[in-house]
Amino acid sequence: APTSSSTKKTQLQLEHLLLDLQMILNGINNYKNPKLTRMLTFKFYMPKKATELKHLQCLEEELKPLEEVLNLAQSKNFHLRPRDLISNINVIVLELKGSETTFMCEYADETATIVEFLNRWITFCQSIISTLT
């Protein structure tokens, strides 16, 4: 059974992930980003189901494409280079989903824009956090 300290750690990691995803969304989804329209042409694959931490496997698999899109943005949009930002997110995702169980991600038929993709994972984080508090 999860201890209160492990629950607290999970909550903090989710909050960190949430803030990173929100920062990316705010950095790209505004009219001051001249590459927004170009970024919206990139396809992202969405999870068929995202209700548990193991489903973060689906996010992990889309981090490389996410980095490619973020490379189009000006560095001033974020406080870190895309490579470092994605690396940080990857570390959190690996810790949260755990590496001891292998989970095969199932993707939905519908693809999404980067904005829809980020909003989906932001909602996921918020949902899990709410169950922990």
């Epitope: 009219y31 001249p34 927004l36 970024m39 042409t41």
Partner: antibody, heavy 119, light 108 residues
């Protein structure tokens, strides 16, 4: 209604210059990145250049880099394309086009203006 | 350089289904968009993000994408659908806009 009205086309000799204008109305011009797209007679569409909402960032197709300059005057709601060292292959209908902020394409186009480069 | 490949022309009778293809290596990771351009007019967006239809575009226009191929379908083509159709996307790396060569649709 949302509109882009173009002016400034015409016939020009190779090596000479020409400036196109695109007047925007019906939307907050300063909130949108803008583009120029061209179409040679009987041919397909070719993206030419993009300018950011405030004019600070500009991107060009390789075919016009160093010869064409895009600019904007947000106080006049107007987009410009300065074309220098014109070549016969620049002969085309030139369209100004607005970048959509919600989908990855151009959502509003000007009526087009013909530029003919000929001696 | 990256290219989007379309058939140059297609002819259908009124009421028939017109299917226009667009091939691009990046389509598994890029959305396809479709513009209609009638003679002497500016292009009009008829499909975005592979399958979505802008408001005001008739339901007979639909889009799909699978692998490296995007498709525009006009179910029950009408005489007023006669136009050039261009697929559009962006390059895989720098994401500069790119158009297909266009398909001239004749409805007669």
């Amino acid at each position: 209604q949302v509109q882009l009205v173009q002016s400034g086309g015409g016939v020009v000799q190779p090596g000479r210059s020409l400036r196109l204008s695109c007047a925007a109305s019906g939307f907050t011009f300063s909130n949108y990145a803008m583009n120029w797209v061209r179409q040679a007679p009987g041919k397909g569409l070719e993206w030419v250049t993009l300018i950011s909402y405030d004019g600070s960032q500009k991107y060009y197709a390789d075919s016009v880099k160093g010869r064409f300059t895009t600019s904007r005057d947000n106080s006049k709601n107007t987009l410009y394309l300065q074309m220098n060292s014109l070549r016969a292959e620049d002969t085309a209908v030139y369209y100004c086009a607005r970048d959509s902020t919600t989908l990855g394409a151009f959502d509003v186009w000007g009526q087009g203006t013909m530029v003919t480069v000929s001696s | 350089s990256y290219e989007l490949t379309q058939p140059p022309s297609l002819s259908v009778s009124p009421g028939q289904t017109a299917t226009i293809s667009c091939s691009g290596d990046a389509f598994p990771r890029k959305f396809a968009y479709w513009y209609q351009q009638k003679s002497g007019q500016a292009p009009v967006l008829v499909i975005y993000e592979d399958t979505r239809r802008p408001s005001g575009i008739p339901e007979r226009f639909s889009g799909s994408s699978s692998g490296t191929m995007a498709t525009l379908t006009i179910s029950g083509a009408q005489v007023e659908d006669e136009a050039d159709y261009f697929c559009y996307s962006t390059e895989p790396t720098v994401a500069h806009p790119i158009f297909g060569g266009g398909t001239k649709l004749t409805v007669l």
